[in-house]
């Protein structure tokens, strides 16, 4: 990962900002409200901070989603864009700001009285849409905190990992997201070597469990670096 240019107290390994990226109409590039950092004897702010490159929504902030900055642009170049407010057009839930979700191409409120029924409809409706639900149900709605009093079991539809019971994570499965088991030691895991590879996964694996990390299997020697098998291993 690339280092940022601020200071050693920063989250350095998040990718540095891209220059000159502009959002397409109705999708403003998100701008940080100013970053504080120690500069001499007083704090200075940086107001013209640019967005981060990303491979998936989870790499962006909670008020952002990951997409190509221009319509019909290079699919490989994605950045974190500001989330869409209510009544704005959308293609998937993650595009909508917290408290909203994507229904029939429009961001609507995650009203707790009717949301549960509509989420089932949305799976069916979205099936044929132009890659609209590859990223499935994402983290933005208030579903887990306001509606699900019991955590989702394996196979339950989810929006984020906190919707799932302990030992499970929320991962893509076809065109939705379901609770799947967190990976155990020795299990095959996915290590994304190239940015943008996440979007191709319609059967997403969970992350490795506590105390484990996804690393190349030591005895797995293949000619191609990218095809090496990764497994969950103790730190």
């Amino acid at each position: 990962t690339l280092n940022s240019v601020l200071n050693s107290n920063a989250i350095k390994n998040l990718p540095p900002p891209l220059g000159g990226a502009a959002g397409h109409p109705g999708s403003a590039v998100s701008a940080a409200p100013g970053i504080l950092y120690p500069g001499g004897n007083k704090y200075q702010t940086i107001d013209n901070y640019q967005p981060y490159p990303c491979a998936e929504d989870e790499e962006c902030g909670t008020d952002e989603y990951c997409a190509s900055p221009t319509r019909g642009g290079d699919a490989g170049v994605q950045i974190c864009l500001a989330c869409r407010k209510r009544r704005k057009r959308c293609m998937r839930h993650a595009m909508c700001c917290p408290g909203n979700y994507c229904k029939n191409g429009i961001c609507v409120s995650s009203d707790q009285n009717h949301f549960r029924g509509e989420i089932e409809e949305t799976i069916t409706e979205s099936f044929g849409n132009d890659h609209s639900t590859l990223d499935g149900y994402s983290r933005r709605t208030t579903l887990s905190s306001k509606m699900y009093h019991t955590k989702g079991q394996e196979g339950s539809v989810c929006l984020r990992s906190s919707d799932c019971a302990s030992g499970l994570c929320c991962a893509r499965h076809f065109w939705s997201k379901i609770c799947k088991p967190v990976l155990k030691e020795g299990q095959v895991c996915t290590k994304h070597r190239r940015k943008g590879s996440h979007g191709l996964e319609i059967f997403q694996r969970c992350y490795c469990g506590e105390g484990l990390s996804c690393r190349i299997q030591k005895d797995h020697h293949q000619a191609s670096n990218s095809s090496r098998l990764h497994t969950c291993q103790r730190h």
């Epitope: 989250i11 970053i35 120690p38 790499e59 902030g61 909670t62 974190c80 983290r139």
Partner: nanobody, 125 residues
Framework: EVQLVESGGGLVQAGGSLRLSCTAS????????VGWFRQAPRKEREFVTA????????DYADSVKGRFTISRDNAKNTAWLQMNSLKPEDTAVYYC??????????????????WGQGTQVTVSS
Amino acid sequence: EVQLVESGGGLVQAGGSLRLSCTASGSAFSSSVVGWFRQAPRKEREFVTAINWSGARTDYADSVKGRFTISRDNAKNTAWLQMNSLKPEDTAVYYCAAGSDRYARVLTEYEYVWWGQGTQVTVSS
């Protein structure tokens, strides 16, 4: 509002391991960046590592890369710092901190708005 409590500190020999936990109360935890900082005697507080709201992005100070691992479980409102191959120079009070992760961008320690009380880690040679 997020309250953070660190645990898991202690005395360990050089080369040993410790795992620190940071347990949060408050619903904002799952949408926050979580970072670990440390402060050794007579030294300034320094950044150790951080993880974004989803766990998809992590960062480490050069001095701990390859030895420390940060992880989190939003369902448990907890973050962990696994510290391996500890060195005497890792001796410090370790603080867990959290800050808004609304936008994917660099955070400095001044933007971490919630802090724990700290847990002492002592590495003997």
